[in-house]
């Protein structure tokens, strides 16, 4: 898709980063084998991918976590892919839910989310989880990205 | 994306194959409803997808497996998507981990991996698992592919 | 990929819908934050995505379900992505299997399927599950889509 200057490739793939913040929004970094095609997609504040051009994007996230049923709330572990468009409320695009494992001390599970969505200029996407402390940040386990169709 | 001769579509989707080899690298075949767009991507030695052109690729793998917690080591089942570029060491692109099931004799689980990565000419990608004997090779359960953006 | 009139973008993302039908084929709707790029892909009878143009498509589905091992059959929960081409038998493209959870009243799990396939004009893809009553229809949990390369 060498699309020429008028229609360049737009793609990103960022890597999870452990954070001391208590927010449920996962943190990401341009590290390891990351992708950031050009400045038409940017990682802002380490938490959201923001696009400059309107269009259809395939957006994906993968989250690996380790949890135990007895040590967790009864609610499952939920990962949510969310959208914030300029002048609009946040909205959920995709969610996945996995009940906590009975394995001790914790059982690892991986979630994958992905779908095609229309994004407006300045739109941002980010990933929320129920308990960030359970997320695995080992090489390749948790990542987030998009590509413009 | 009929891209013309200068910029043809490049895509592959290959199907898992049971193997007598004791290696942790999964084996694949061009069988069933497979995809191999042209010779700009090839399946080499039944184990790796190799690309001829540099660029951004969305690479994915799905692995279904059946395992039992009592019969397994404490380590989870891990599937890894790995990259070997010419003149470089192998590196992990993506991993997923699932703790073994308590179901007897084994419990089935499916893992999906996918992300956007820059590949160099001659780069190969392959899939590693902790125990190939646990992998499910029934129709559609385990597959591997890529597409060039 | 502003491809021009000759080669327009073709993409869809549809949202799960609870159904009173006893069929194992999941039902979908153009609701919420859905995508339907143009009339070259259509949602037919609320159950299948049908394409008008031949080519390579990345097709995906995500299914979240809640089940319990004691209350379910011994067979795992299986989600299948299926293809019906004109004048051909249905065939399975992708499947994922997850053994039922021991959590009570039920344990949630999410499945993601995705792959690159050649579709003929008039081909339809749909999603089958072993027990539709176990599927979660909350915002973002279960969705289905495709994009033409």
């Amino acid at each position: 898709m060498q699309k020429g200057d008028q229609n360049p490739q737009i793609a990103a793939h960022v890597i999870s980063e452990a954070s001391s913040k208590t927010t449920s929004v996962l943190q990401w970094a341009e590290k390891g084998y990351y992708t950031m095609s050009n400045n038409l997609v940017t990682l802002e504040n380490g938490k959201q991918l923001t696009v400059k051009r309107q269009g259809l994007y395939y957006i994906y996230a993968q989250v690996t976590f380790c949890s135990n049923r007895e040590a967790s709330s009864q609610a499952p572990f939920i990962a949510s892919l969310c959208l914030k468009s300029p002048g609009r409320f946040e909205r959920i695009l995709l969610r996945a839910a996995n009940t906590h494992s009975s394995a001790k001390p914790c059982g690892q599970q991986s979630i994958h989310l992905g779908g095609v969505f229309e994004l407006q200029p300045g739109a941002s996407v980010f990933v929320n989880v129920t308990d960030p402390s359970q997320v695995s940040h080992g090489t390749g386990f948790t990542s987030f990205g998009l590509l413009k169709l | 994306m009929q891209k013309g001769d200068q910029n043809p579509q490049i895509a592959a989707h290959v199907i898992s194959e049971a193997s007598s080899k004791t290696t942790s690298v999964l084996q694949w075949a061009e069988k069933g409803y497979y995809t191999m767009s042209n010779n700009l991507v090839t399946l080499e030695n039944g184990k790796q997808l190799t690309v001829k052109r540099q660029g951004l690729y969305y690479i994915y793998a799905q692995v279904t497996f059946c395992s039992n917690r009592e019969a397994s080591s404490q380590a989870p089942f891990i599937a890894s998507l790995c990259l070997k570029s010419p003149g470089r060491f192998e590196r992990i692109l993506l991993r997923a981990a699932n703790t073994h099931s308590s179901a007897k004799p084994c419990g089935q689980q499916s893992i999906h991996l996918g992300g956007v990565f820059e590949l160099q000419p001659g780069a190969s990608v392959f899939v590693n698992v902790t125990d190939p004997s646990q992998v499910s090779h029934g129709t559609g359960f385990t597959s591997f592919g890529l597409l060039k953006l | 990929m502003q491809k021009g009139d000759q080669n327009p973008q073709i993409a869809a993302h549809v949202i799960s819908e609870a159904s009173s039908k006893t069929t194992s084929v999941l039902q979908w709707a153009e609701k919420g934050y859905y995508t339907m790029s143009n009339n070259l892909v259509t949602l037919e009878n609320g159950k299948q995505l049908t394409v008008k143009r031949q080519g390579l498509y990345y097709i995906y589905a995500q299914v979240t379900f809640c089940s319990n091992r004691e209350a379910s059959s011994q067979a795992p929960f299986i989600a299948s992505l299926c293809l019906k081409s004109p004048g051909r038998f249905e065939r399975i493209l992708l499947r994922a299997a997850n053994t039922h959870s021991s959590a009570k009243p039920c344990g949630q799990q999410s499945i993601h399927l995705g792959g690159v396939f050649e579709l003929q004009p008039g081909a339809s893809v749909f999603v089958n599950v072993t027990d539709p009553s176990q599927v979660s229809h909350g915002t973002g949990f279960t969705s289905f889509g495709l994009l033409k390369l």
Partner: nanobody, 118 residues
């Protein structure tokens, strides 16, 4: 095509013993487990025991109801599994099915009847 064939079933008195065998034939590339299920009249098929090879070689797993009475073993070179059943009870009466995860798929035998009765 891989096939599983059971043998060794029959009539036995309570407290008695039987040994079941299951032989796998065909082109076998990999095995995760070989084991046994059983189905009593009017009941669902239930897990009995399994012997694991692959990366879990040497492990065995049993249903609670047969622990201490039944022993599963396997001869991996012959792709054969054995179930030694001791201290049999009338409630062990069932059709016993060999099951195996071979070449990445679940396979079943045709079953052999075990009757425990005085």
């Amino acid at each position: 095509e891989v096939q599983l064939v059971e043998s060794g079933g029959g009539l036995v008195q309570p407290g008695g013993s039987l040994r079941l065998s299951c032989a796998a034939s065909g082109r076998i590339f990999s095995t995760y487990f070989m084991g046994w299920f059983r189905q009593a009249p009017g009941k669902e098929r239930e897990f009995v025991a399994a012997s694991y090879t692959g990366g879990s070689g040497g492990s065995t797993v049993y249903a609670d109801s047969v622990k201490g009475r039944f022993t599963i073993s396997a001869d991996n070179s012959k792709n054969t599994a054995y179930l030694q059943m001791n201290s049999l009870k009338p409630e062990d009466t069932a059709v016993y099915y060999c099951a195996a995860w071979l070449n990445g798929g679940n396979r079943w035998g045709q079953g052999t009847l075990v009757t425990v009765s005085s």
